[in-house]
Interface confidence: low
């Protein structure tokens, strides 16, 4: 018998590049049971993690396994950084590994940035 | 070519509302989002905010909450902004405008004139 | 929010010179700023982004440049239909925000 527990499928030390200026859809792959558990998504600032109230979410079901989607509409450059998301199930509370994003210009779209490039251009630093 | 065609300039009295249209033409509506500034003469441009007519998502600038509304009509590929509570203050030039975070184009402005 | 502040309401200039329009943000916004032209009773015009990524069609005599906090466009050999309100915008964080203007003029 499949576990009713809720589980939060983000792969530890998963990345997306993506552009600034672009929309962008953050995906948080969510397995439960009967009843869709409460999540919410957060921004990493040092050791505490944000919650992003005023965001646009939404669901995404798919046959065996949903999605909880975070909307980037568009992508600005200050969006840079890890990001996790959590799950209220039962009393409980469950988080996801972090995910970071690298927000990269459109001059610099085909490549990860250097931690030279990163020093000189801080909209690309960790925040 | 890419246009933005708002509504004409519009003459209201004080505590009334108004709806602002931007109609699209030359892209796809939905691939973009479409912001709304706000321009006092001798004043800088004020950004209201954008509604992505994708799935209808808005961002509000703070200041602009529970004064502006945003919305989108896909099947005309026009954007609205509806202003309430009309006074003086609200008296300006509003414009839309597209392509992302720095606008490549935009409307042609509509004054908003709030007297009695 | 960050305020973008343009020292000079006003500048003086003949046609020929070169000009330099500048731009302080009230907290580092990186290379995320972009400069308008508003012509009167027009839109305004996008000339310059990412600080200094000039738009196709803007003519080579307008540059931008700086990060960080301080930004600069010049306009070299300054023609008489470069008259105009001048504005920067920062994209960095929301509120996006724009400077308040500056208008170039003939001396």
């Known amino acids: 018998k499949e576990s009713c527990d809720v589980q939060l499928y983000i792969k530890r030390q998963s990345e997306h590049s993506i552009l600034a200026g672009d929309p962008f859809e953050l995906e948080c792959p969510v397995k439960y049971c009967a009843n869709r558990p409460h999540v919410t998504w957060c921004k990493l600032n040092g050791t505490t993690c944000v919650k992003l109230e005023d965001r646009q979410t939404s669901w995404k079901e798919e046959k065996n396994i949903s999605f909880f989607i975070l909307h980037f509409e568009p992508v600005l450059p200050n969006d840079n950084g890890s990001y996790r998301c959590s799950a209220n199930f039962q009393s409980n509370l469950i988080e996801s590994h972090s995910t970071t994003l690298y927000v990269t210009d459109v001059k610099s779209a085909s490549e990860r940035p250097s931690k030279d490039e990163m020093a000189s251009r801080p909209w690309l630093l960790y925040r | 070519q890419d246009q933005l065609q708002q509504s004409d300039a519009e003459l209201v009295k004080p505590g009334a509302s108004v709806k602002i249209s931007c109609k699209v033409s030359?892209?796809?509506?939905?691939?973009?989002?479409i912001h709304w500034m706000k321009q006092r003469p001798e004043q800088g441009l004020e950004w209201i905010g954008y509604?992505?007519?994708?799935?209808?998502?808005?961002k509000y600038n703070e200041k602009f909450k529970g004064k502006a509304t945003l919305t989108a009509d896909k099947s005309s590929s026009t954007a609205y902004m509806q202003l309430n509570s009309l006074t003086s203050e609200d008296s300006a030039v509003y414009f839309c405008?597209?392509?992302?975070?720095?606008?490549?184009?935009w409307g042609q402005g509509t004054t908003l004139t709030v007297s009695s | 929010d960050i305020v973008m502040t343009q020292s000079h309401k006003f500048m003086s200039t003949s046609v020929g010179d070169r000009v330099s329009i500048t731009c302080k943000a009230s907290?580092?916004?990186?290379?995320?700023v972009a400069w308008y032209q508003q012509k009167p009773g027009q839109s305004p015009k996008l000339l310059i982004y990412?600080?200094?990524t000039r738009r196709t069609g803007v003519p080579d005599r307008f540059t931008g440049s700086g990060s960080g906090t301080d930004f600069t466009l010049t306009i070299s050999n300054v023609q008489s239909e470069d008259l105009a309100d001048y504005f920067c915008?920062?994209?960095?964080?929301?509120?996006?925000?724009f400077g308040a203007g500056t208008k170039l003029e003939l001396k």
């Open positions: 405008a597209s392509s992302n975070w720095n606008f490549d184009y």
């Open positions: 030359g892209y796809t509506f939905t691939d973009h989002t």
């Open positions: 509604i992505y007519p994708r799935d209808g998502s808005t």
């Open positions: 907290q580092d916004v990186g290379t995320a």
């Open positions: 990412w600080a200094s």
């Open positions: 915008q920062q994209y960095s964080s929301y509120p996006l925000t």
